[in-house]
Amino acid sequence: ESGYAQNGDLEDAELDDYSFSCYSQLEVNGSQHSLTCAFEDPDVNITNLEFEICGALVEVKCLNFRKLQEIYFIETKKFLLIGKSNICVKVGEKSLTCKKIDLTTIVKPEAPFDLSVVYREGANDFVVTFNTSHLQKKYVKVLMHDVAYRQEKDENKWTHVNLSSTKLTLLQRKLQPAAMYEIKVRSIPDHYFKGFWSEWSPSYYFRTPEINNSSGEMDPI
């Protein structure tokens, strides 16, 4: 539980930039939470570097991270989930740099899954649905979702729709006829907890029907 490195200590090590970032995932494995940290500089020599978290823990002073290639990882039930923890990069007993972080403000939800799109011919629309593991969780239950879709040929022209439910209706007339679309979704905490966007769900691809010449409407696929 040593503090910051003293001046003159570990002189070579202190020439490096040990900036790091972390994210937490709550109830990621049953009732277990996880905390993942990584250096912002991918070229940092991590050979002798360790991460340690102290404070805001249940009945322990500190926990050590496991090293998994270039990331550092903890899975535990021992987060109090209130107040700030002290997360330090260490060489042996010496701390090179530390950050005070409230784990409830760096939550990264799990990626949504089971994304699908169903065309409703009578309604002339597409119903987008997806699932999230957070519906079953005790803590991070309220999420904002970002649904992004694009015509496959338009590499960077994504249209984004924010929603709090797991169902979205896209009107057929807003989409190009006879076109292939890619759609994906991600999530971010939206109540009490704060943090980062999840990873994107796997993309789903769907084709819009052609326009029916006589009526000006799209043909079903």
């Epitope: 539980e1 404070g55 249940v58 002073k61 989930l81 209130i82 107040g83 700030k84 005070k100 803590y139």
Partner: antibody
Amino acid sequence: QVQLVQSGAEVKKPGASVKVSCKASGYTFTGYTMNWVRQAPGQGLEWMGLINPYNGVTSYNQKFKGRVTLTRDTSISTAYMELSRLRSDDTAVYYCARGDGNYWYFDVWGQGTTVTVSS
Amino acid sequence: EIVLTQSPATLSLSPGERATLSCSASSSVTYMHWYQQKPGQAPRPWIYEISKLASGVPARFSGSGSGTDYTLTISSLEPEDFAVYYCQEWNYPYTFGGGTKVEIK
């Protein structure tokens, strides 16, 4: 203003249990830990445990684990400390204290509840 | 578990004198806090995170230290400063020192 108001003094027999309440006002109850600290007559301070009122997660001093139970009722912003199997050396003033989560010090204290254990 | 030893147990000084209270930890502590307690009253936060003065604490108080040795200093004692002062580690199990009583000589 921020305030913690504790229940009144108690006299208990050895082997009995005591439950002390701590009513919080003037702040968001679920935003800070509630800690319990005791002080035997003429002695120093001893941390017993804490509760996170948001989720009910508790952390106990190993010395008291199994004898102390911390609970809360968020609807009335009140925390409770129950100590069981009382002994004469549990005679003390029991304080609730709000935990500042940025620095982990106890920034607001209740007035204290005197618990006397005597046969 | 870390043990915090405060010295001296009692400090007998006159108003206007300088007071130096020590808190020694059995192993390294990142942050230390200090509380003031007067007879019949609850403790009051006095100095937190080594050197930050709690609300309403006069500037004649200061805190310093690192590792295992921490100090609370009162530059010039005022009558209201005579009390018991406790140090406390910031982390589980939030151990307190035994206290230093600052009394009027």
